[in-house]
């Protein structure tokens, strides 16, 4: 994960406000909010594990890396980071593990340099379609975001507001085509069962896509064709049973791709023949020698690369336990 990190030294803790009369003034450039640590030299502010319930209003204008992890923010309203003057330098924002369950439209507006955003480990029951685009226009101003980290943002089952979680996340990613410049997208550990058709085609700049530790059961309608810049595709720990010819051809056609497929319940029947042939020839699958059959029972733990066509017959009757992960 590419969350903002800091080599910051010389952090200053916040000092108590000296005079209430000053509070109406804009914050001093070197002021540090209460319960935070600041390093102007590293352009970094850390407000970590302090049970904050809202984003500090008096963030210093120099901040480039902002850590607001391990808090209790609950809701990120529109303009949560809008300041006068704006936080024009803020490039990396980490909000992971801050108990956010709602991110509203325009929450990240007025952050012209924001390149990395990490919302991981927040139970996002309500992610506005316009959280990242800021407006409901059919085409929004391009977002400066290059990396978006959304690992483990799935809320508990009883908080999902009776709608598709996959759909909610996809709506936010595609709204207004604002994220056309996105290069890294991490969506690991979100219980995704599917991706709507053609969703990836609308994120053409992707270099790194992490879909590991979900419950994806098929890639049949997931097109990678337009993702010519894609360098890494993480599909470990899903519920994939076989990759079909169309998918294999698309992956093979990507010039820089490395694919990770470990720990999927591969079904080694006659429909696996094309994938086995491809695996033996391709260089794009990392750790391909670790891929093993899960079904049928007689094939369990057989290494895919060691199979030949005589091993792959049809049709297995699978136990109910296979059908989803």
């Amino acid at each position: 994960s590419s969350s903002p990190t800091s080599s910051a030294s010389s952090f200053s803790s916040s000092a108590p406000f000296l005079a209430s009369a000053v509070s109406a003034q804009p914050p001093l450039p070197d002021q540090c909010p209460a319960l935070c640590e600041c390093s102007e030299a590293a352009r970094t502010v850390k407000c970590v594990n302090r049970n904050l319930t809202e984003v500090p209003t008096d963030l210093p204008a120099y901040v480039r890396n902002l850590f607001l992890t391990g808090n209790q923010l609950a809701v990120l309203p529109a303009g949560a980071f809008a300041r006068r003057p704006p936080l024009a330098e803020l490039a990396a924002l980490n909000l992971s593990g801050s108990r956010l369950d709602e991110v509203r439209a325009g929450a990240f507006e007025h952050l012209p340099s924001l390149r990395q955003l990490d919302l991981s480990h927040n139970p996002l029951a309500d992610l506005s379609p316009f959280a990242f685009s800021g407006s409901n226009a059919s085409v929004s101003a391009p977002s400066p975001l290059v990396e978006l980290i959304l690992n483990h943002i799935v809320p508990p089952e009883d908080e999902r507001q009776n709608r598709s979680f996959e759909g909610m996340v996809v709506a936010a990613l595609l709204a207004g085509r604002a994220l056309q410049g996105l290069r890294r997208l991490e969506l690991a550990s979100n219980h995704f069962l599917y991706l709507p058709r053609d969703v990836l085609a609308q994120l053409p700049s992707l270099r790194h896509l992490d879909l590991s530790n979900n419950s994806l059961v098929s890639l049949t309608y997931v097109s990678f064709r337009n993702l010519t810049h894609l360098e890494s595709l993480h599909l470990e720990d899903n519920a994939l049973k076989v990759l079909h010819n169309g998918t294999l051809a698309e992956l093979q056609g990507l010039p820089h791709i490395r694919v990770f497929l470990d720990n999927n319940p591969w079904v080694c029947d006659c429909h696996m023949a094309d994938m086995v042939t491809w695996l033996k020839e391709t260089e794009v699958v990392q750790g391909k020698d670790r891929l093993t059959c899960a079904y049928p029972e007689k094939m369990r733990n057989r290494v895919l690369l060691e199979l030949n066509s005589a091993d792959l017959d049809c049709d297995p009757i699978l136990p109910p336990s296979l059908q989803t992960s």
């Epitope: 595609l174 599917y194 058709r197 053609d198 429909h271 059908q323 989803t324």
Partner: antibody
């Protein structure tokens, strides 16, 4: 909440054409394919085809090529199906249906009855 | 085109019964099968997708299983409101095709 509102029933003469509309609300129209399905009286369901509202790309069941034309108007979040050269065989209820998981239709319109009668 | 053969066509049931409907594909459709319920005078409703995954708000008495060519849909304890026609559908290859339907009626 997701809603698909279809246009009202149609009674048309053989050889004529008809255009059915399906107005979508409650979700981002361009994020999901729209499918069209035919159901003749007392019969099963037949998939006519689908359209990607994002770019207008269509897939048709070969059986309905030349019979049905699928289009969308993104500005009004509306999908359309035109049926031409109608015969009594085309009398049926026609549904639009939003795709969720690829191919599976998670929300359906209320249906539009088309009766071809001279 | 892939043919989905659904059996039986009719089922007479009593409240509390366990009901099983089967669908056989003319060729493998992997795990790309959905099940729908259509009550009289209503539009179809998606119950199950990708063989065994319940759609939002669908009670857990509805389950699906299978892989390849043979699929089963089960209602563990039928209730009066389950009286409807049930359809399987393959979404593995175009054109997507439906089974002929199974009508559930009360004894």
């Amino acid at each position: 909440q997701v809603q698909l509102q279809q246009s009202g029933p149609e009674v048309v003469k053989p050889g004529a054409s008809v255009k059915i509309s399906c107005k979508a609300s409650g979700y981002t129209f361009t994020d999901y394919y729209m499918n069209w399905v035919k159901q003749s009286r007392g019969k099963s369901l037949e998939w006519i085809g689908d359209i990607n509202p994002n770019n207008g790309g269509t897939n048709y069941n070969q059986k309905f090529k030349g019979k049905a034309t699928l289009t969308v108007d993104k500005s009004s979040s509306t999908a359309y199906m035109e049926l031409r050269s109608l015969t009594s065989e085309d009398s049926a209820v026609y549904y639009c249906a939003k795709e969720g998981p690829p191919g599976a239709m998670d929300y359906w319109g209320q249906g539009t009855s088309v009766t071809v009668s001279s | 085109n892939i043919v989905m053969t659904q059996t039986p066509k009719f089922l007479l049931v009593s409240a509390g019964d366990r009901v099983t409907i089967t669908c056989k594909a003319s060729q493998s459709v992997s795990n790309h099968v959905a099940w729908y319920q259509q009550k009289p005078g209503q539009s179809p409703k998606l119950l199950i997708y990708y063989v065994s995954n319940r759609s939002i708000g669908v009670p857990d008495r509805f389950t699906g299983s299978g892989y390849g060519t043979d699929f089963t849909f089960t209602i563990s304890t039928v209730q009066a409101e389950d009286l409807a026609v049930y359809f399987c559908q393959q979404v593995y290859s175009s054109p997507f095709t439906f089974g002929g339907g199974t009508r559930l009626e009360m004894k």
